[in-house]
Interface confidence: medium
């Protein structure tokens, strides 16, 4: 393929003033291929070379790459020519980096942590913003406070529980030593003790067909928020579920095809078949979303012999309600995430 300057940073490094060497030619036409394709080590993709001529074992992370010897696309690698600027001759296979994020008109770099307000600490990971609440969810006392409610306290960021007492004015639900921290205390506690936190899964990125759902968890050695992702398919795009709603009913909460099926992803097929349930639809303004769900691990096999697995949303039950959230409101799920463990995860 043609010569093209390689990825560099915004400032251009001048090439050496004198260079009489020739750029090597990596592709030859007509194609010259060995009689049989190579056998690749376990986990290495067998792909067509960059000359679109012969089968080759894809170059792996850290390997040299050229227009002919290309990096393993199944492993998210690309040929980084920045060390050969801007000759575009020999590069090194590197990991594709995530793109940045835009939130409320502000651009953040991939991996950047930021606080959009006092209630959340957010991280940009590969184009998705994941946020962890800085205001800890202390449950209201169930026994001695009949009417707890959360109120904003002037000068404090986080809302606090107060106990509505019919006879008296509202009072705080607990004395200072029972864990009802103020905003500063909560932030300090978060950083000092590393309170384990896993956010709920975000809504599926598509309302039908294959999408992605993400969550942020700091359950790791560094106590650093990392993004997990799973595939999701709330409902098929090619089935008109409206036609399946029974006469006199306004909704079909769950749709389950009769036949089992294999999942497909990027030309690769799941190693076993499944009979998934999908969320249905309503005739009115209500929307149907997963109510009981879990995450399953699905193994895929590719035509070139490569195998991999992905986490996938498995729907057990859906419910239809009017709170159809704005998919662009990234805080919506965090504001009112469910306390029922069977709804999340």
């Amino acid at each position: 393929t043609a010569l093209s300057p390689a990825p560099t940073t915004m400032d251009f490094t001048p090439a050496p003033l004198e260079d009489t060497s020739s750029r090597p030619q990596f592709c030859k036409w007509p194609c010259e291929c060995p009689p049989s394709p190579p056998r690749c080590p376990l986990g290495v993709s067998l792909i067509t070379d960059g000359c679109e001529c012969c089968k080759m074992c894809a170059q792996q992370l850290g390997d040299n790459c050229t227009e002919a010897a290309i990096c393993d696309p199944h492993r998210g690698l690309y040929c980084d020519y920045s060390g050969d600027r801007p000759r575009y001759a020999i590069g090194v296979c590197a990991q594709v980096v995530g793109v940045g994020c835009v939130l409320d008109g502000v651009r953040y770099n991939n991996g950047q942590s930021f606080q959009p307000n006092c209630k959340y600490n957010c991280t940009c990971i590969d184009g998705a913003v994941g946020c962890t609440p800085l205001c800890l969810r202390v449950r209201p006392p169930r026994l001695w406070c009949p009417h707890p409610r959360r109120v904003s306290i002037p000068g404090h960021c986080c809302e606090q529980w107060v106990c509505e007492d019919d006879a008296k004015r509202p009072r705080k639900t607990a004395p200072r030593d029972t864990g009802a921290f103020d905003a500063v205390g909560e932030v300090e506690a978060w950083h000092r003790n590393c309170i384990a936190y896993t956010s709920p899964w975000s809504p599926c990125s598509t309302s039908c067909g294959l999408g992605v759902s993400t969550r942020i968890s700091n359950v790791n050695a560094q106590c650093w928020p990392e993004q997990e992702s799973r595939l999701c398919n709330l409902r098929p795009c090619d089935v008109d579920i409206h036609t399946l709603i029974k006469a006199g009913k306004k909704c079909l909460a769950v749709y389950q095809p009769e036949a089992s099926m294999n999942f497909t992803l990027a030309g690769c097929i799941s190693t076993r078949s499944y009979q998934p349930k999908y969320c249905g639809v309503c005739m009115d303004n209500r929307c149907c979303i997963p109510y009981k769900s879990k995450t399953i691990d699905v193994s895929f096999q590719c035509p070139d012999g490569l195998g991999f697995s992905r986490q996938v949303l498995w729907i057990n039950a859906c419910f239809c309600n009017l709170s159809c959230r704005n998919p662009n409101d990234i805080f919506a799920d965090l504001e009112s995430y469910p306390d029922f463990s069977e709804i999340a995860n």
Partner: antibody
Framework: EVQLVQSGAEVKKPGASVKVSCKAS????????INWVRQATGQGPEWLGW????????GNAQNFQGRVFMTWDTSKDTAYMEMSSLRSDDTAVYYC??????WGQGTLVTVSS | DIVMTQTPSSLSASVGDRVTITCRAS??????LNWYQQKPGKAPKLLIY???SLQSGVPSRFSGSRSGTDFTLTITNVQPEDFATYYC?????????FGQGTKVEIK
């Protein structure tokens, strides 16, 4: 088959901005640079800059620094080139090119009051 | 910036002729030079890369050579579909620069 399909022609007023899209297919989008080149009628091509969706890096020609903004969407295998503060001499056909070998069909941008 | 000086700016030829177009770089660019063909209303099409490597699918009547900072595109046995404008491009250093073009017309 490698293909780059660009968005349709645009007519803009001076001072406005334009955003041209370039949808890639037939290859792994993150593995190659996308270069942006423009060509005014009867003139030779002029290079604007490049982006690499794999590394997340971009670089502009000096003349266009601060006026050309290149972005991409890996989920759509699409690159974008946005040019702001348009002037009448920005009237040209804008091309995207994969590593300078495969080119899009071009997008005519006309800047006129 | 590296300046690419392309000559001639236009030439006339007949079918079957041999045509030569040259490009001179203002400094050494090794062999980091591409040649393109462009027809009216169409995008440039890559013919030769790395000064002398023929792009896949391009007829063998097109060839390229290099002598120091001088580069030559040769079309032997010109065909009717070869009448177009040809550009050289250097990809040795940023910014990428093009020659001003050579229009090959029918005599």
């Amino acid at each position: 088959e490698v293909q780059l399909v660009q968005s349709g022609a645009e007519v803009k007023k001076p001072g406005a901005s334009v955003k041209v899209s370039c949808k890639a297919s037939g290859y792994t989008f993150t593995s190659y640079d996308i270069n942006w080149v423009r060509q005014a009628t009867g003139q030779g091509p002029e290079w604007l800059g490049w982006l690499n969706p794999g590394s997340g890096k971009t670089g502009n020609a000096q003349n266009f620094q601060g006026r050309v903004f290149m972005t991409w969407d890996t989920s759509k295998d699409t690159a974008y080139m946005e040019m702001s503060s348009l002037r009448s001499d920005d009237t040209a056909v804008y091309y995207c090119a994969r590593n300078l070998d495969y080119w899009g069909q071009g997008t005519l941008v006309t800047v006129s009051s | 910036d590296i300046v690419m000086t392309q000559t001639p700016s236009s030439l006339s030829a007949s079918v079957g002729d041999r045509v030569t177009i040259t490009c001179r770089a203002s400094q050494s660019i090794s062999s980091y030079l591409n040649w393109y063909q462009q027809k009216p209303g169409k995008a440039p099409k890559l013919l030769i890369y790395a000064a002398s490597s023929l792009q896949s699918g391009v007829p063998s009547r097109f060839s390229g050579s290099r002598s120091g900072t001088d580069f030559t595109l040769t079309i032997t046995n010109v065909q009717p579909e070869d009448f177009a404008t040809y550009y050289c491009l250097q990809a040795y250093d940023f910014p990428i620069t093009f020659g001003q073009g050579t229009k090959v017309e029918i005599k």
